[in-house]
């Protein structure tokens, strides 16, 4: 699986999850998030050669088409597969609130 | 929606579904498919500027991050959203067989 366990331990050029730290205030301008100050959102990148973690029959077909037609511009793209939520603390005035934001952290990637 | 109705009628540079005809024999080397000879598989391509048909909170966050940090290499990618099956005819010896291949045709795209 193209997950953090594999991708963060290997120098993988092809589609894999990459570490990306985002600071809420500096990178997004989100002043309303109190804690954490930032988090590892991660992202997916790298080429999708034929059959690499193909998501659907279409991505397999497209990967094969691309292999046999190297000049073609149509190829699968490396995108998130598994995402996890992030728990944040914010304030409503002086009152602290805890919220779970869904689909915030990329744990693995696929070729789609 | 970034679907064939919209994308095929507009000269859209950003993420959209693009027509792609695939000939089973010539492009994939699939001699076993009798009918059709080929089909419009289509594909997704084009930049994913901030908020363009964002798939998840992560892709929205990544798009925002990319907008505020233009030098960043992390950005969402244009990939299939809705896929449709394709019915094919093939032969087992002289016996015709009809099969529905799932997820063969891209009908719309998203930024993921």
């Amino acid at each position: 699986a193209l997950d953090t366990n594999y991708c963060f331990r290997n120098l993988e050029e092809n589609c894999c999850v990459r570490p990306l730290y985002i600071d809420f205030r500096q990178d997004l301008g989100w002043k309303w998030v109190h804690e954490p100050k930032g988090y590892y959102a991660n992202f997916c990148s790298g080429p999708c050669p034929y059959l690499r973690s193909a998501d659907t029959t279409h991505s397999t077909v497209l990967g094969l088409y691309n292999t046999l037609n190297p000049e073609a511009s149509a190829s699968p793209c490396c995108v998130p597969q598994d995402l996890e939520p992030l728990t944040i603390l914010y304030y409503v005035g002086r009152t602290p609130k805890v919220e779970q934001l869904s689909n915030m952290v990329v744990k693995s990637c696929k070729c789609s | 929606a970034l679907d064939t109705n919209y994308c095929f009628r507009n000269l859209e540079e950003n993420c959209c579904v693009r027509p792609l005809y695939i000939d089973f024999r010539q492009d994939l080397g699939w001699k076993w498919v009798h009918e059709p000879k080929g089909y419009y598989a289509n594909f997704c391509s084009g930049p994913c500027p901030y908020l363009r048909s964002a798939d998840t909170t992560h892709s929205t966050v990544l798009g925002l991050y990319n907008t505020l940090n233009p030098e960043a290499s992390a950005s969402p990618c244009c990939v299939p959203q809705d896929l449709e099956p394709l019915t094919i005819l093939y032969y087992v010896g002289r016996t015709p067989k009809v099969e529905q291949l799932s997820n063969m045709v891209v009908k719309s795209c998203k930024c993921s």
């Epitope: 997004l28 989100w30 309303w32 005035g93 002086r94 919220e99 | -």
Partner: antibody
Amino acid sequence: EVQLVESGGDLVKPGGSLRLSCVASGFTFSSNVISWVRQAPGQGLEWMGGVIPIVDIANYAQRFKGRVTLTADTSTNTVYMELSNLRTEDTAVYYCARTLGLVLDAMDYWGQGTLVTVSS
Amino acid sequence: EIVMTQSPASLSLSQEEKVTITCRASQSLGSSYLAWYQQKPGQAPKLLIYGASSRAPGVPSRFSGSGSGTDFSFTISSLEPEDVAVYYCQQYADSPITFGQGTKLEIK
């Protein structure tokens, strides 16, 4: 230039409902919090609630809970306020405003307002 | 909810006079959860002061705010004709946000 434009104000019968829109431009919509404030004719200002568009977290004044729903569409930079079971005392100019960044905060940019009249 | 009591309800002063409006909260707001707005007829409110004493961008220096806890004040050092408006204080320490009832400022 920062702009907030409200629309959807109308003459409504008591018991009816209404959806107001607030379209934002000139700033990073998804990094901000949008509040709704109303003002009855000749009266003061009353805060109704606020929403964080990117994650659709909404906070409401207690007296409007159950009657007001705030939602956001980040693809169109629009915040919506649905107000149901309207009463004559809901007649007011409804403003959307951008906060300085927190859920409860001062509001630095306001729309021009949209008038809602509740009458039979 | 926190009740904000503004005084006076209205005042009429001469041009170049000093204006002081006070705002009292029914419970402590700490030092920074208070804002002041100006509203002219037919217009939306305009933020003048936030955090009790910080001027919003583009607001003339004749406008100032001070105070903490339950007692806050807003001052116009020298009244000008364009300052004719209704002024509101607003607390954002606790939900719901509440406003004072307003002070109508006129020129004699």
